[in-house]
Interface confidence: medium
């Protein structure tokens, strides 16, 4: 069978499974004169043989783990043993079978984890090796937690990355681990080959002892600080501590105060830097942050609460320079004249703001002193001794002392004695007829003038008239303003009129005095008037139930998913058709009838969130009036962006020859959402072949260091592939390339002869 098992001498590659006893020849080479015999050289390992006539075979089972490729040469010789053809390369690739079990590098691992550590952040790696080919399932390892001891309420506190062996806390572990309750745990971890998928896989186990350490990064108790402290500042008020020394502490004022009177030192001690004033601000909430040496937050911020304790540093204040009250001539003893309400800026409902009232002087003292009394705590003035006479004394002036426990303030009250209120207001007409208005009449319009008169003393509370609508306007669409000089009432529109809900309103007005009527006098029909308001229809645009509609969905929702809905009603009851405006990205469609909004394309938070479009509601029929509202779609992040280099790193170079191993630092980023702590990338070399020359080590969640392992580099450009994993759900990996040039240097810069100006590296390492 020419071609498959026999043929002329030429370079060839054969694949043979390891572990199999020889069952057939590999190949029969045919000699072309003057060649008569064949010779085999190279990595034969005394397994591969060629007979003089050209029959290539092997004499015992191969072992890929001893040698995965045998590089052989076959030459054709003439009768004198001189090579007349070849030698040509013959490559034997040994194919892997699963003949090696995985083994852990250690039979026991020990590690520690801090309580409340971030879920999913590895704190320990277990590592197993398998001599089989990692490019096949035979060498693909799968890690699993077999058991966790103790197991509380059947809840796993630990998890393992099946591929990397990274052990981290679960969300429950992050929340519930407590060294005071359980300081140590034991895990039994298994590793299987065949990617864990086959019943025929080999396995190994190891034991992991985990110590739980206390997390001392905790919010301190709320602090109370007395205002106006005269002690020397700054004063230490509390402290925070990161779990290890060397953290850089700072305070964050979320309220963005113009004056932020707190500071923190590099031990985590928190100080108030100046006296506080409770009346300016009675409580502060701010955050303490701990960062690493690169300025990356080490954990979540702690909330610090400071309550400012009151001292009595404010005197009572009067409501106005002079407070004026009126009292009718005939009022009886004990009647209330009015209440003086003084204020105190100190803390409410405490002794510091609790006020006492006392009359210290009455002028004139006619017909006697002590005509008035004031309730000590309420400040209510009452008539104390007798009814007053206007012709004797039309006005009294009182000096009232208002005091808290430390301060006294004098307030002044003027009491005007006025005529008795024995006349009621009388409307000039009892019926103001009909008034027809369109429903779109402007708010603030005066639609009617009404007038009542009162024969009591002018410009007193006995003759002043207040108009009230007592019937026919339960919605409060109308109001009445009174001119204090003429007692004219102006009926105005306060809220939009509405034909659909109130086409005809029978309005009733009442005219009253602010002063009480004397005993025996009552308001009667003369103090009431009416009018009829007729509202005519105006075709109005539909009305949305909200100015802004908001919905929240994950950015990876399937096309066709309902993402929200809007509703509008037409005042005239017409049907409504919905449409979208400003859907610049073409992501959405709206159901014209129901107002439901659906996705019609893949959404992308990184393109911008929230996504804002306008929704339009249009009358069907009629005059096709329309209204516009906003729809805001908030897109929640999913991990859909692999890490990449944060900037362009072309132009990195080392001066050749290297005198010592060198290193350079690079930064990664990705476009997904990273909350307070930022990304937590892991870094590794992109291919195994790079490991002899380079190593990559993580500095923090975003930065890593690429170092040379030796100094024996050629004078050329090397492209170093680096794998960056974001550890997200699901984890995404980016492979980036860092081009590093080794070049002759002049004064620390790459030297290029003339004519070699392209791509000159610009950054020396």
């Amino acid at each position: 069978q020419e071609g498959k098992f026999s043929g002329p001498l030429k370079p060839m590659t054969f694949s043979i499974y390891e572990g199999q006893e020889p069952s057939q020849i590999i190949f029969q080479f045919k000699a072309n004169p003057p060649a008569v015999t064949f010779e085999l050289t190279g990595e034969t390992d005394n397994i591969f043989v060629i007979e003089r006539e050209g029959l290539l075979y092997y004499n015992r089972a191969l072992d890929r783990e001893t040698r995965s490729t045998h590089n052989l040469q076959v030459a054709a010789l003439d009768a004198n043993g001189i090579i007349v053809e070849g030698p040509v390369p013959i490559t034997i690739k040994v194919k892997d079978i699963n003949d090696n079990r995985p083994t852990f590098l250690q039979s026991k691992y020990e590690g520690s984890v801090r309580q409340n550590s971030r879920p999913g952040k590895p704190f320990l790696y277990v590592n197993a090796t398998d001599l089989d080919d990692p490019a096949t399932p035979n060498g693909q390892l799968y890690y699993q937690i077999v058991i966790q001891l103790p197991m509380i309420n059947n809840v796993m506190y630990f998890q393992i990355n099946n591929k990397t062996g990274a052990i981290s806390l679960t969300r429950e572990g992050s929340q519930e681990l407590n060294p005071a309750k359980n300081p140590s745990y034991n895990l039994v971890i298994s590793v299987k080959d065949m990617g864990g998928q086959s019943e025929n896989s080999f396995s190994d186990t190891t034991s992991v002892d985990i110590i739980v350490t206390e997390n001392i990064w905790k919010a301190p108790k709320p602090v109370e600080m007395v205002e106006n402290s005269t002690d020397p500042h700054p004063i230490k008020i509390t402290q925070v501590r990161w779990n290890d020394p060397g953290a850089q502490y700072s305070l964050v004022d979320k309220e963005k105060l113009p004056r932020f009177p707190f500071s923190i030192d590099q031990e985590g001690d928190i100080y108030v830097t100046q006296p506080l004033d409770r009346e300016e601000k009675d409580a502060y909430v701010f955050y303490a942050v701990a960062k690493d040496e690169y300025g990356k937050p080490l954990s979540y911020p702690l909330e610090i609460h400071v309550k400012v304790k009151d001292i009595n540093d404010n005197p009572p204040t009067c409501p106005s320079p002079v407070t004026v009250f009126e009292v009718q001539e005939n009022e009886r003893l004990g009647n209330s004249i009015g209440t003086l309400t003084a204020h105190d800026r100190d803390e409410e409902n405490t002794a510091n703001s609790f006020l006492n009232y006392r009359i210290v002087e009455q002028t004139p003292k006619l017909p006697m002193d002590g005509l008035f009394l004031i309730q000590t705590y309420a400040g209510m003035l009452q008539l104390a001794k007798q009814s007053l006479k206007k012709q004797d004394t039309p006005q009294y002036n009182l000096t009232i002392e208002v005091s808290d426990k430390d301060f006294k303030t004098l307030c002044f009250v003027q009491i005007n004695v006025i005529d008795i209120n024995d006349q009621i207001p009388i409307f000039e007409k009892s019926d103001y007829g009909n008034l027809t208005l369109a429903e779109d009449t402007n708010i603030g319009s005066t639609i009617l003038t009404i007038q009542a008169t009162d024969a009591d003393e002018p410009f007193t509370g006995s003759s002043k008239i207040l108009y009230h609508i007592i019937k026919g306007d339960s919605e409060g669409r109308l109001g009445v303003d009174t001119d204090p000089h003429t007692n004219t009432g102006y009926v105005i529109i306060k809220k939009p009129l509405d034909f659909e809900t109130a086409a005809v309103s029978n309005i009733v007005f009442k005219a009253e005095n602010p002063e009480p009527l004397v005993f025996g006098v009552k308001y009667n029909a003369s103090s009431f008037a009416k009018f009829t308001l007729i509202v005519t229809d105006v075709n109005e645009a539909p009305q949305f139930s909200q100015h802004v509609f908001q919905a929240k969905v994950s950015e990876d929702v399937a096309i066709g998913t309902k993402v929200g809905n809007v509703t509008a009603k037409d005042p005239e009851g017409l049907d409504i058709s919905y449409s979208l405006r400003g859907d610049t990205r073409g992501w959405l469609k709206i159901d014209h009838v129901t107002g439901e909004i659906f996705s019609v394309a893949p959404l992308d938070r990184e393109a911008g969130s929230p996504y804002r479009v306008q929704v339009v509601a249009t009358e069907v029929g009629g005059s096709s009036l329309s209204s516009v509202s906003e729809f805001h779609l908030i897109l929640m992040d999913v991990n859909d962006n692999p890490p990449r280099l944060a900037k362009d790193y072309t132009g990195l170079f080392f001066c050749h020859p290297l005198s010592a191993p060198g290193s350079l630092i690079f930064e990664a980023t990705d476009d997904d959402q990273h909350l307070f702590r930022g990304p937590h990338f892991t870094f590794s070399l992109g291919s195994g072949s790079l490991q002899n020359d380079w190593e990559v080590s993580k500095i923090n969640g975003t930065h890593a260091r690429l170092s040379t392992r030796h100094t024996e580099f050629e004078e050329r450009e090397y492209v170093v592939l680096i794998r960056i994993n974001d550890g997200g759900r699901p984890p995404l990996e980016g492979i980036v390339s860092l081009p590093v040039t080794f070049c002759s240097c002049v004064e620390g810069s790459c030297f290029r002869p003339a004519g070699h100006q392209t791509g000159i590296p610009t950054v020396g390492m």
Partner: nanobody, 118 residues
Framework: QVQLQESGGGLVQPGGSTRLSCVSS???????MGWFRQAPGKEREFVAL????????EYSDDVHGRFTVSRGNTQNSVNLQMNNLKPEDTGIYYC????????????WGQGTQVTVSS
Amino acid sequence: QVQLQESGGGLVQPGGSTRLSCVSSRTFSYYDMGWFRQAPGKEREFVALLSWRGNNAEYSDDVHGRFTVSRGNTQNSVNLQMNNLKPEDTGIYYCAVTYGGARSVRLWGQGTQVTVSS
């Protein structure tokens, strides 16, 4: 290896006084130093703690007002002056280096015996 070396203690009459000293073989920035004790048949308990700067001291309720913790001649040493001793103060006294309070001990001394008895 870093070591803590305690000295002092021994047999003391009730009502009497003694002074314990502790020196660390290395200076720890930002770490606090203090004392713990373990009475026979009991768990080790907190006694006193001195902040790294030496400006804050903390005591257990049992010893407050009787014991005083102070910095030694150097930044890496700490003393415990024990006055008005009671029989219940008997135990092994351990020097400790902590960070962030009494519950986070990072390094223990070997301990020194204090016996209060007539």
